[in-house]
Interface confidence: medium
């Protein structure tokens, strides 16, 4: 399977109190689960809606309600793929104060789509 | 038409076992997730837990976590909420929905009746 | 665990605004949804990710969040919005979610 994280760079810059929208890609693979993972652990939250774009490429999505200090960090996704872990490259996620000018490449994904998500 | 249908009002003894099933149509079954929620007699809604669209995680409330087993068949497009031993408390509407947030898609509602 | 509060009963007269208010700890950083239940039947999604009004719901319905608190609006309540409301949302963690206890609309 190949994974990407899209619509972000290597750094994603948000000012705090912001939300914060991270796609993942997965080719390659008929329904994957992915899994968000921050610093080497796995996000305790339940999943984002899965973006079927085709039958082997489906897009995931990890939101944030409201970054905190305690959001900074680099994140990936990964699914299993025939036992084995695959991982994403990384994304880095820093905050600059509240009000301050961020590069919010996190509006990125397609503004169509509407998906389920608790976190601010 | 998306529609799940639920299986048959039950009544069991306490200490029972009982697996009541919720069929699923009209989309695909993995594309979403499947919720199941209680609501007791007169009582509010109580999220009890739901499964991943793909059938291979699960995430329980703390209430029921241990007590309650959900599972799904994905060839059938059947999710499951399981009890090994019932207790009076078990008596209650369970609906299972589709989704975990935006719960769009409700069941009619399986009732459970525990009583000696 | 997790709980979110609820008031238990809200009357207004119709016509006027009803305010149904929602209380978490988790609240400033998670979304909260609502759903309406009436008598004998299954709930419906009112509102969703705070503020987002659901498909088919009348444009009195609208939602608010700030800090710990998430508030349900419906400006010129009606007869038919008679019914229990309940707020959904996660814990702080974000493993399992949580409904509030309901709160009981009473249009007359």
């Known amino acids: 399977a190949g994974l990407k994280l899209m619509g972000a760079p290597v750094k994603l810059t948000v000012s705090q109190g912001q939300p914060v929208k991270l796609n993942c890609s997965v080719e390659g693979m008929e329904e994957p689960d992915i899994q968000w993972v921050k610093d080497g652990a796995v996000v305790q939250n339940l999943d984002q809606l899965y973006i079927p774009v085709s039958e082997q490429h489906w897009i995931g999505f990890l939101s944030l309600k409201s970054v905190e200090r305690s959001d900074a960090g680099r994140y990936w996704c990964q699914v299993e793929d025939g036992g084995e872990t695959e991982i994403s490259q990384p994304v880095w996620l820093t905050l600059v104060p509240r009000g301050s000018s961020a590069h919010h490449h996190h509006h990125h994904h397609h503004s169509a789509w509407s998906h389920p998500q608790f976190e601010k | 038409e998306v529609q799940l249908v639920q299986s048959g009002a039950d009544v069991k003894k306490p200490g029972a076992s009982l697996t009541i099933s919720c069929q699923a149509s009209g989309y695909t079954f993995t594309d979403y997730w499947i919720s199941w929620v209680r609501q007791k007699p007169g009582k509010g809604l109580e999220w009890m837990g739901s499964?991943?669209?793909?059938?291979?995680?699960?995430h329980y409330g703390p209430s029921f976590q241990g007590h309650v087993t959900i599972s799904a068949d994905r060839s059938t497009a059947t999710a499951y909420l399981q009890w090994r031993s019932l207790e009076a408390s078990d008596t209650a509407m369970y609906y299972c929905?589709?989704?975990?947030?935006?719960?769009?898609?409700w069941g009619p509602g399986t009732l459970v009746t525990v009583s000696s | 665990s997790y709980e979110l509060t609820q008031p238990p009963s809200v009357s207004v007269s119709p016509g006027q605004t009803a305010r149904i208010t929602c209380s978490g700890d988790a609240l400033p950083k998670k979304y909260a949804y609502w759903y309406q239940q009436k008598s004998g039947q299954a709930p419906v999604l009112v509102i969703y990710?705070?503020?987002k009004r659901s498909s088919g719901i009348p444009e009195r319905f609208s939602g608010s969040s700030s800090g710990t608190m998430a508030t349900l609006t419906i400006s010129g309540a009606q007869v038919e919005d008679e019914a229990d409301y309940y707020c959904?949302?996660?814990?702080?963690?974000?493993?399992?979610?949580?409904f509030g206890g309901g709160t009981k609309l009473t249009v007359l």
């Open positions: 929905v589709r989704g975990y947030t935006h719960l769009r898609t």
């Open positions: 959904y949302s996660a814990n702080q963690r974000g493993n399992y979610m949580v």
């Open positions: 499964i991943t669209r793909s059938s291979s995680r699960t």
């Open positions: 990710e705070d503020s």
